[in-house]
């Protein structure tokens, strides 16, 4: 059976939107009006992995682009990147672990924990116009809480 996917945008708990920053990076900044069109639309696929009531494994692709968020070690540090894939083979139910995030819902907010690197989360900074990254701390200065907005296909 084909993998189930939905289109959505994400905003951090400061209401910053996510946009492309160069070919292989995302950044977070406040957008309004026409600029809202810049925000990336994700194709969130529901994939195989450990699942519970509040924890759902997903892959985050960029809609109509053959790019997926992935978690890899760079200089011995878990790092978030946008990775190019063959569109003929993706998305698929059994995604490689580096593409999988545990979508965790807490108090109407979402966290995205790397399946490859437990306790590392998709994060943004308080500052404007700075990269989205994989952070190893929750509840500190860095933001790990997001809201999801559904986008019609």
């Amino acid at each position: 059976a084909p993998v189930r996917s939905l289109n959505c945008t994400l905003r951090d708990s400061q209401q910053k939107s996510l946009v492309m920053s160069g070919p292989y990076e995302l950044k977070a900044l406040h957008l309004q009006g026409q600029d809202m069109e810049q925000q990336v639309v994700f194709s969130m696929s529901f994939v195989q992995g450990e699942e519970s009531n509040d924890k759902i494994p997903v892959a985050l692709g960029l809609k109509e682009k053959n790019l997926y968020l992935s978690c890899v070690l760079k200089d011995d540090k878990p790092t978030l990147q946008l990775e190019s894939v063959d569109p003929k083979n993706y998305p698929k139910k059994k995604m490689e672990k580096r593409f999988v995030f545990n979508k965790i819902e807490i108090n109407n907010k979402l966290e995205f924990e790397s399946a490859q690197f437990p306790n590392w989360y998709i994060s943004t900074s308080q500052a404007e116009n700075m990269p989205v990254f994989l952070g190893g701390t929750k509840g500190g200065q860095d933001i790990t809480d997001f809201t999801m907005q559904f986008v019609s296909s």
């Epitope: 920053s21 160069g22 900074s125 700075m130 860095d142």
Partner: antibody, heavy 118, light 107 residues
Framework: EVQLLESGGGLVQPGGSLRLSCAAS????????MFWVRQAPGKGLEWVSV????????RYADSVKGRFTISRDNSKNTLYLQMNSLRAEDTAVYYC???????????WGQGTLVTVSS | DIQMTQSPSSVSASVGDRLTIICRAS??????LAWYQQTPGNAPKLLIH???SLQSGVPSRFSGSGSGTDFTLTINSLQPEDFATYYC?????????FGGGTKVEIK
Amino acid sequence: EVQLLESGGGLVQPGGSLRLSCAASGFTFSKYFMFWVRQAPGKGLEWVSVISPSGGMTRYADSVKGRFTISRDNSKNTLYLQMNSLRAEDTAVYYCARVGYGGNSDYWGQGTLVTVSS
Amino acid sequence: DIQMTQSPSSVSASVGDRLTIICRASQDINRWLAWYQQTPGNAPKLLIHSVTSLQSGVPSRFSGSGSGTDFTLTINSLQPEDFATYYCQQADSFPLTFGGGTKVEIK
């Protein structure tokens, strides 16, 4: 008054290492992104590296990737740049700078000169 | 990487002149552009950020304009202390990049 004071520069042989420090005062250091920017003698400005307030996010120029490491100690209000495998082309004045709105450098230190030569 | 090209690379002018420096980005950088002034032996000083926003304490004879890929720094009525080198910088994406600089000399 915002102050940034670099130290640790000097003469080093090719292949050698050096650690630069930048002591910050006059603002809440732990809330700001920080940059290192360098300027070779008689040349323009080159961005080197950035670090987030928590230290969780770092980025580097391709020219220094894998050789330089940016870090910070918020308890000491100090920014660092560990420079390994130094090359002649790393010779420059190294500035630390506080990151202002959206990625500009709103305050700069006076710079410290690094000379890589045999 | 985004390339930033400044022109002219140097210019001779007189006190009281109106001067325009151009900065071109190799791709759209939205409004993430800053201008700096550097005098010999000193660190750069932020003049303008977000294309048009004057940094606190910078005289109003400095102004910035532009959008997308083409930007200008204008100095109305050059003063003796304005003879320096000026750099543009994009902050749209990492690696951040600077223009090559424009040296403003006394005619």
